[in-house]
Interface confidence: low
């Protein structure tokens, strides 16, 4: 899968990014800052079906995802 559980030997969590994810299917969005484990920021989306996918933090698409999550959160309040 796109998310690796192996976090040893300076390896990143994300092996591949998913270019398209329906924001409605995202349950949780986690951002992992760059550090000794991985030299780049990583974004992991936990989907409502239990799967995890990685997103590119620089992708224009991700901004849309975050905005839609924020918008849906605001509507609930």
């Amino acid at each position: 899968g796109p998310v690796s559980a192996v976090l040893t030997e300076l390896r990143c969590t994300c092996l591949r990014v998913t270019l398209r994810v329906n924001p409605k299917t995202i349950g949780k969005l986690q951002v992992f800052p760059a550090g000794p484990q991985c030299s780049k920021v990583e974004v992991v989306a936990s989907l409502k079906n239990g799967k995890q996918v990685c997103l590119d933090p620089e992708a224009p698409f991700l901004k849309k995802v975050i905005q839609k999550i924020l918008d849906s959160g605001n509507k609930k309040n």
Partner: antibody
């Protein structure tokens, strides 16, 4: 700074094979994908495949399955491309490149390796 | 595979002129497009990624725009160093595919 140093020009016979190397420096090799691209005069740029050394993942263009094999030695931060059953169609400049983020745009490029197939 | 139609295939322009090169994808690639400059016997150099973002060290006279299927690279004021071949690349779908290139020369 990120650098990709490729092996030199090769003159090889038809039917033989060749291995091109791409030594990476200036970044954590196992964190990024290495991409290989072919360029022939008048044919533009063509994606061959890519490799993620951190997990041993490789993906190939349908056009290069059975032609190219991508490997890496993480201890020396070097990626390799092995080409077999060479013909004149394989005469080209081959570039390695590092992805910008995972399998996305090609941020940094090697200088290219010229392969000439001739009898 | 996604086909990238790049135009023009070649063009000539004067110093200081505004130059625009376009790429059209055969389907929506959602801004997963980058632009590369290549000079003879040299490796490609990244200019723009994600359709609009300027790569490190690239002069601000270069800019990218577009969305959906249609994208463009613009040089606001042509300099002699800009004579080269320019390629677009889509990476929204696998396999990544390049445009055929635009050869830019000075008038």
């Amino acid at each position: 700074q990120v650098q990709l140093q490729q092996s030199g020009a090769e003159l090889v016979r038809p039917g033989t094979s060749v291995t091109i190397s791409c030594k990476a420096s200036g970044y954590t090799f196992t964190n990024y994908w290495i991409v290989w691209v072919k360029q022939r005069p008048g044919h533009g740029l063509e994606w061959i495949g890519d490799l993620y050394s951190g997990g041993g993942y490789t993906f190939y263009s349908e056009n290069f399955k059975g032609k190219a094999t991508l490997t890496a030695d993480t201890s020396s931060s070097t990626a390799y491309m092995h080409l077999i059953s060479l013909t004149s169609e394989d005469s080209a400049v081959y570039f390695c490149a590092r992805s910008g983020y995972d399998r996305t745009w090609f941020a940094h490029w090697g200088q290219g390796s010229l392969v000439t197939v001739s009898s | 595979d996604i086909k990238m139609t790049q135009s023009p295939s070649s063009m000539s322009a004067s110093l200081g002129e505004r130059v625009t090169i376009t790429c059209q994808a055969s389907q929506d690639i959602e801004s997963y497009l980058s632009w590369y400059q290549q000079k003879p016997w040299k490796s490609p150099k990244t200019l723009i990624y994600y359709a609009t973002r300027l790569a490190d060290g690239v002069p601000s006279r270069f800019s990218g725009s577009g969305s959906g299927q249609d994208y463009s690279l613009t040089i606001s004021s042509l300099e002699s160093d800009d004579t080269a071949t320019y390629y677009c690349l889509q990476h929204g779908e696998s396999p990544p595919t390049f445009g055929a290139g635009t050869k830019l020369e000075l008038k």
